[in-house]
């Protein structure tokens, strides 16, 4: 899905006033310093390409991350204000919620939704310089 | 069972407000998005705005913003409308409608009416 | 943000088919495959009959079929029956500026 016509600042702000709080709260525990930012991106299209990837692909080591809050409502949010958010994309996404059976907060998961924190940050800031 | 229930008919005069109740039930009320679609007599159906408890985001048509006030209360299942300024084009049965879990604008399920009447 | 445009009648015998029509623009019906179909009986709520432009919720007969073509979407009901006869509402999404419009609707009379 191409993510360039989506609506930004609405965006932002769902994140803002809700989806932040969720990453928070996973989180909860672990040092801010624990992990290591290697995921980035140049822009916002760009950020909600690797925001939705990280989200909703299984990885090694972390399967679960679609049935977590911050991934509902980030899917809700994309829903609503990317116009044409491909109904295969959320398909896709429903289909992988409804085939874990359980919540495991691994390590790896950790380590990914501080990933995801990172993009979310970065999709905040869009006219800072990639460092 | 899954349903939409809506509380009861009103009548209401020019240049007051009306507040009109919707209780979801059987499902879960937050994932959906609750909209507000009016159909004046005879005529065709309206769109006036839309509430995703999920996500608390609330979006109105252009016709209706700052006239339209749509909330929900995730304890009791509960999505409301407000109208202000209430004019007699108002005259509408009002519906609430349940959009489809992030598919907001297919409305698979529909409250049974509540007639608004504005007269003076 | 004018509504879709819909002939405002149309009708058919028992047994035969019918299309209904609903006309909007590249911003709404032909932008996105976010058309949904909507049957109304006197006095009652509408009912979800096709949705994403072709498919059918459970319970819907599979007399009802919607397409899309361009910037015009159709349903088609064949096998036309008595209970048919209501009022038929096409709706599409158009983009996070307007985000809904309905058409003025079609009334279906069975002959």
């Known amino acids: 899905y191409d993510f360039t016509n989506c609506d930004f600042e609405k965006i932002k702000a769902a994140y803002l006033s809700t989806i932040s709080k969720d990453l928070i709260t996973y989180m909860s525990g672990t040092k801010s310093t624990e992990f290591n930012n290697t995921v980035s991106c140049s822009n916002r299209p760009h950020c909600l390409t690797e925001i939705q990837s990280l989200t909703f692909n299984p990885t090694a080591g972390c399967a679960s991350l679609a049935k977590e809050m911050f991934a509902m409502k980030t899917k809700a949010a994309l829903a609503i204000w990317c116009p044409g958010y491909s109904e295969t994309q959320i398909n896709a996404t429903q289909a992988m919620k409804k085939a874990r059976k359980s919540k495991v907060t691994t390590n790896k998961c950790l380590e990914q939704v501080s990933q995801l924190q990172g993009l979310w940050r970065r999709f905040n800031r869009p006219l800072l310089k990639q460092q | 069972q899954v349903q939409l229930v809506q509380s009861g008919a009103e009548v209401k005069k020019p240049g007051s407000s009306v507040k009109v109740s919707c209780k979801a039930s059987g499902f879960t009320f937050g994932s959906y998005g609750i909209s507000w679609v009016r159909q004046a007599p005879g005529q065709g159906l309206e769109w006036l705005g839309v509430?995703?408890?999920?996500?608390?985001?609330?979006i109105y048509a252009e016709k209706f913003q700052g006239r339209v006030t749509i909330t929900a209360d995730t304890s009791t299942s509960t999505a409301y409308m407000e109208l202000s300024s209430l004019r007699s084009e108002d005259t509408a049965v009002y519906y609430c409608?349940?959009?489809?879990?992030?598919?907001?604008?297919?409305?698979?399920?529909w409250g049974q009416g509540t007639l608004v009447t504005v007269s003076s | 943000q004018s509504a879709l445009t819909q002939p405002p009648s149309a009708s058919g015998s028992p047994g035969q088919s019918v299309t209904i029509s609903c006309t909007g623009t590249?911003?709404?019906?032909?932008?996105?495959?976010?058309v949904s179909w909507y049957q109304q009986h006197p006095g009652k709520a509408p009912k979800l009959m096709i949705y994403?432009?072709?498919k059918r919720p459970s319970g819907v007969p599979d007399r009802f079929s919607g397409s899309k073509s361009g910037n015009t979407a159709s349903l088609t009901v064949s096998g036309l029956q008595a209970e048919d006869e209501a009022d038929y509402y096409c709706?599409?999404?158009?983009?996070?500026?307007?985000?809904?419009?309905f058409g003025g609707g079609t009334k279906l009379t069975v002959l």
């Open positions: 994403e432009f072709n």
């Open positions: 709706s599409s999404y158009a983009g996070t500026d307007i985000f809904v419009l």
């Open positions: 590249s911003s709404d019906i032909g932008g996105y495959n976010r």
């Open positions: 509430i995703v408890p999920l996500v608390g985001v609330t």
């Open positions: 409608a349940r959009g489809q879990e992030y598919f907001y604008w297919y409305f698979d399920l």
